[in-house]
Interface confidence: medium
Amino acid sequence: TKTESSSRGPYHPSECCFTYTTYKIPRQRIMDYYETNSQCSKPGIVFITKRGHSVCTNPSDKWVQDYIKDMKEN
């Protein structure tokens, strides 16, 4: 199968995040996360969904911080 990116969301970042999602991703969809490289022009947290999609998010958003905290604790 193929997984396509969409103009409606910042999917499949290569190394850096240039845009952030404007949607709060449902927590139950998220499998993992990683921080983008510190040399990127913008900071980013990339959430990986249970279907393998990667989504750029803003590390300043409270929901992003809450999700990271939750995943670290669990």
Partner: antibody, heavy 123, light 113 residues
Framework: QEQLKESGGGLVQPGGSLKLSCKAS????????MSWVRQAPGKGLEWIGY????????AYASWVNGRFTISSHNAQNTLYLHLNSLTAADTATYFC????????????????WGQGTLVTVSS | AIVMTQTPASVEAAVGGTVTIKCQAS??????LAWYQQKPGQPPRLLIY???TLASGVPSRFKGSGSGTQFTLTISDLECADAATYYC???????????????FGGGTEVVVK
């Protein structure tokens, strides 16, 4: 009551196109993935693809080869399947299904199905 | 792509009896397997997900087990209403290729005498 209802099926000529709809009611449409699954007469189930209604991201079975496109209109709680370059082999009942994530791992399962809409490709 | 092989294709049993359906995955899928029941002219109905968790409203006569590549659906105390075709299904995601796919087994017809 949670419900899915497909429409748009019918008789179409080989090489033709069709747009199927699936209206959701009774649940938050964008909270889960939505899939299309088909079943040829007397045959088994065959997954076509899914959409993430939040982002519009899609994934398809390899055999689809770009002939089918899944989209959604979240405000109308409606899922669509655009069928192109149809052949007799595409004759089937097409089901939409809510595609629920597993709590702890990759992928999901189909916990709500529509009744299906029959597409017949014949000249 | 992952392949789900279901056996047998058809099975016959008496009311009150027990039926066992097997589903084999071509590679490990952990416990990410679901079972569905489909009667003629109806859509499939979810019975079991995560290999062994009973879906809402499904009687405990239906039991799912297994993990990795080998899975089993057991229907005990068979009723006439259990006559249907049963399918297994998984979603397989490959981290290496970053693609996912749903796969169904070929189905098993259960005939209740």
């Amino acid at each position: 009551q949670e419900q899915l209802k497909e429409s748009g099926g019918g008789l179409v000529q080989p090489g033709g196109s069709l747009k199927l709809s699936c209206k959701a009611s009774g649940f938050a449409f964008s909270s889960d993935y939505m899939s299309w699954v088909r079943q040829a007469p007397g045959k088994g189930l065959e997954w076509i693809g899914y959409i993430d209604p939040i982002f519009g991201s899609t994934a398809y079975a390899s055999w689809v080869n770009g002939r089918f496109t899944i989209s959604s209109h979240n405000a109308q709680n409606t899922l669509y399947l655009h069928l192109n370059s149809l052949t007799a082999a595409d004759t089937a009942t097409y089901f939409c299904a809510r595609d629920k994530d597993y709590s702890s791992g990759w992928g999901g399962y189909f916990n709500l199905w529509g009744q299906g809409t029959l597409v017949t490709v014949s000249s | 792509a992952i392949v789900m092989t279901q056996t047998p294709a058809s099975v016959e049993a008496a009311v009150g009896g027990t039926v066992t359906i097997k589903c084999q995955a071509s590679q490990s899928i952990n416990s990410y397997l679901a079972w569905y029941q489909q009667k003629p002219g109806q859509p499939p109905r979810l019975l079991i997900y995560e290999a062994s968790t009973l879906a809402s409203g499904v009687p405990s006569r239906f039991k799912g087990s297994g993990s990795g590549t080998q899975f089993t659906l057991t229907i005990s105390d068979l009723e006439c209403a259990d006559a249907a075709t049963y399918y297994c299904q998984t979603y397989y995601y490959s981290v290496d290729s970053s693609v996912g796919s749903n796969a169904f087994g070929g189905g098993t017809e259960v005939v209740v005498k």
